[in-house]
């Protein structure tokens, strides 16, 4: 959010310096031009750090449904299918923006909110703490 | 995104059935109560499918800066530090919501946009296509 000099074609705003409350058009524009942008959909099973996806729904949030990753194992899966506990499966987390209805149940008033979601898992070498 | 019976404490809206344009408060509420929400910040180096982070900036977008992951190798890093090309490093992608200034340069008018971002990488077993 940056204050940009007013353009005559812009909707009017009470706060001329820095908009705190803005108008947002909820007709989503999808910039993913690829016919199939979500090719990662089977990685959760094929990864050496596989994960399950859990459905999280909150009607007061937009989007109301978010699928969260939870790593299946503490360790990582080896080629023979066994779990190697010398390695760690860890969630890759990302902070995302969502809209939260505010006041609650209001259909046309939201507040931006940052939430941390786990998108998938990756296999990492553990940090070994040596005791002196 | 639902038409909810108007609550007397709600801001007024032109569209009573289904809000297309809504008011959004840009004072971000951060629901990440953890003191260090970016725990995964060193995973990009320790992962068997390590990645680099590239800065993507767009002043017409909110947030204007997004960090994108690019996998360092086609294969995955073994315990000895060599790359195993029998496995694949692949990006974990997620569709996220951003705000796009619309009309361009307007400080207080946005449109929701979905973009696909690579959050990190994971090591997967390749799909082998057998030729008959």
């Amino acid at each position: 959010g940056i204050a940009i000099p007013r353009n005559s074609g812009c909707p009017n705003s009470e706060d001329k310096n820095f908009p705190r409350t803005v108008m947002v058009n909820l007709n989503i524009h999808n910039r993913n031009t690829s016919t199939n942008p979500k090719r990662s959909s089977d990685y959760y099973n094929r990864s050496t750090s596989p994960w399950n996806l859990h459905r999280n729904e909150d009607p007061e949030r937009y989007p109301s449904v978010i699928w969260e990753a939870k790593c299946r194992h503490l360790g990582c899966v080896k080629a023979d299918g066994n779990v190697d506990y010398h390695m760690n499966s860890v969630p890759i987390q990302q902070e995302i923006l969502v809209l939260r209805r505010e006041p609650r149940h209001c259909p046309n008033s939201f507040r931006l909110e940052k939430i941390l979601v786990s998108v998938g898992c990756t296999c990492v070498t553990p940090i070994v703490h040596h005791v002196a | 995104g639902i038409a909810i019976p108007r609550n007397s404490g709600c801001p007024n809206s032109e569209d009573k059935n289904f809000p297309r344009t809504v008011m959004v408060n840009l004072n971000i509420h951060n629901r990440n109560t953890s003191t260090n929400p970016k725990r995964s910040s060193d995973y990009y180096n320790r992962s068997t499918s390590p990645w680099n982070l590239h800065r993507n900036e767009d002043p017409e977008r909110y947030p204007s800066v997004i960090w994108e992951a690019k996998c360092r190798h086609l294969g995955c890093v073994k315990a000895d530090g060599n790359v195993d090309y029998h496995m694949n490093s692949v990006p974990i992608q997620q569709e996220i919501l951003v705000l796009r200034r619309e009309p361009r340069h307007c400080p207080n008018s946005f449109r929701l946009e979905k973009i696909l971002v690579s959050v990190g990488c994971t090591c997967v077993t390749p799909i082998v296509h057998h030729v008959a």
């Epitope: 909820l26 959909s41 099973n45 009607p59 937009y62 989007p63 | 909810i4 929701l112």
Partner: antibody, heavy 123, light 106 residues
């Protein structure tokens, strides 16, 4: 026009498996979950589970956990519901229905349904 | 699992009459959806999020309620309203439906 077109009726023996397909058109497949609901003859509706075609995420009614498998192929915009170890009380019409993940003009409810697939389990 | 109990199971009604169908949940739910189903047809979304009419639903229908008690009301019944109506919750897993209320026109 939004359409969910399901595969044709099936007759199966007890212990067998059935796989019902649901081809979606008229909307972006990965913007909506696909839920599966069944209805035994003369009975009410029973929720089986949900799949998000974008992430592959699934959630099942515990009653069907381990026996039902939901999958989706986003290259053909088709969702599938496989039910194994069929019993006579699995005889029902199986419906697929979509549920919005994003705003659009959707009511966050099962707003479009397939025509249903009758699965008959009989020896 | 949340059990939804509809009342009545069956109702025979005269055109123009006011009809009320109730749906009682065994635990509190956020919202209730209602579906209409006619013989040999798929269910149709009728009322979503407790009180919002789905596209094409006549204004004689309304929905209300909160917590454990929800209601679908038809102000002045018409012949085309003969169908089975189901309530549905999705506040907790598994999502559940009521047993249905069959409306017949006298």
């Amino acid at each position: 026009e939004v359409q969910l077109v399901q595969s044709g009726a099936e007759v199966k023996k007890p212990g067998a498996s059935v796989k019902v397909s649901c081809k979606a058109s008229g909307y972006t497949f990965t913007d909506y979950e696909v839920h599966w609901v069944r209805q035994a003859p003369g009975q009410g509706l029973e929720w089986i589970g949900v799949i998000d075609p974008g992430t592959g995420g699934v959630a099942y009614n515990q009653k069907f956990e381990g026996r039902a498998t939901l999958t989706a192929d986003d290259s053909t915009n088709t969702a599938y519901m496989e039910l194994r170890s069929l019993r006579s009380d699995d005889t029902a019409v199986y419906y697929c229905t979509r549920y919005s993940l994003f705003y659009g003009s959707s009511p966050y409810a099962m707003d479009y349904w397939g025509q249903g697939t009758l699965v008959t389990v009989s020896s | 699992e949340i059990v939804l109990t509809q009342s009545p199971d069956f109702q025979s009604v005269t055109p123009k009459e006011k009809v009320t169908i109730t749906c009682s949940a065994s635990s509190s739910v956020n919202y209730m959806h209602w579906f209409q189903q006619k013989p040999d047809q798929s269910p149709k979304l009728w009322i979503y999020r407790t009180s919002n009419l789905a596209s094409g639903v006549p204004s004689r229908f309304s929905g209300s309620g909160s917590g454990t008690d929800y209601t679908l009301t038809i102000n002045s019944l018409e012949a085309e309203d003969a169908a089975t109506y189901y309530c549905q919750q999705r506040s907790s897993y598994p999502w559940t439906f009521g047993q249905g209320t069959k409306l017949e026109i006298k």
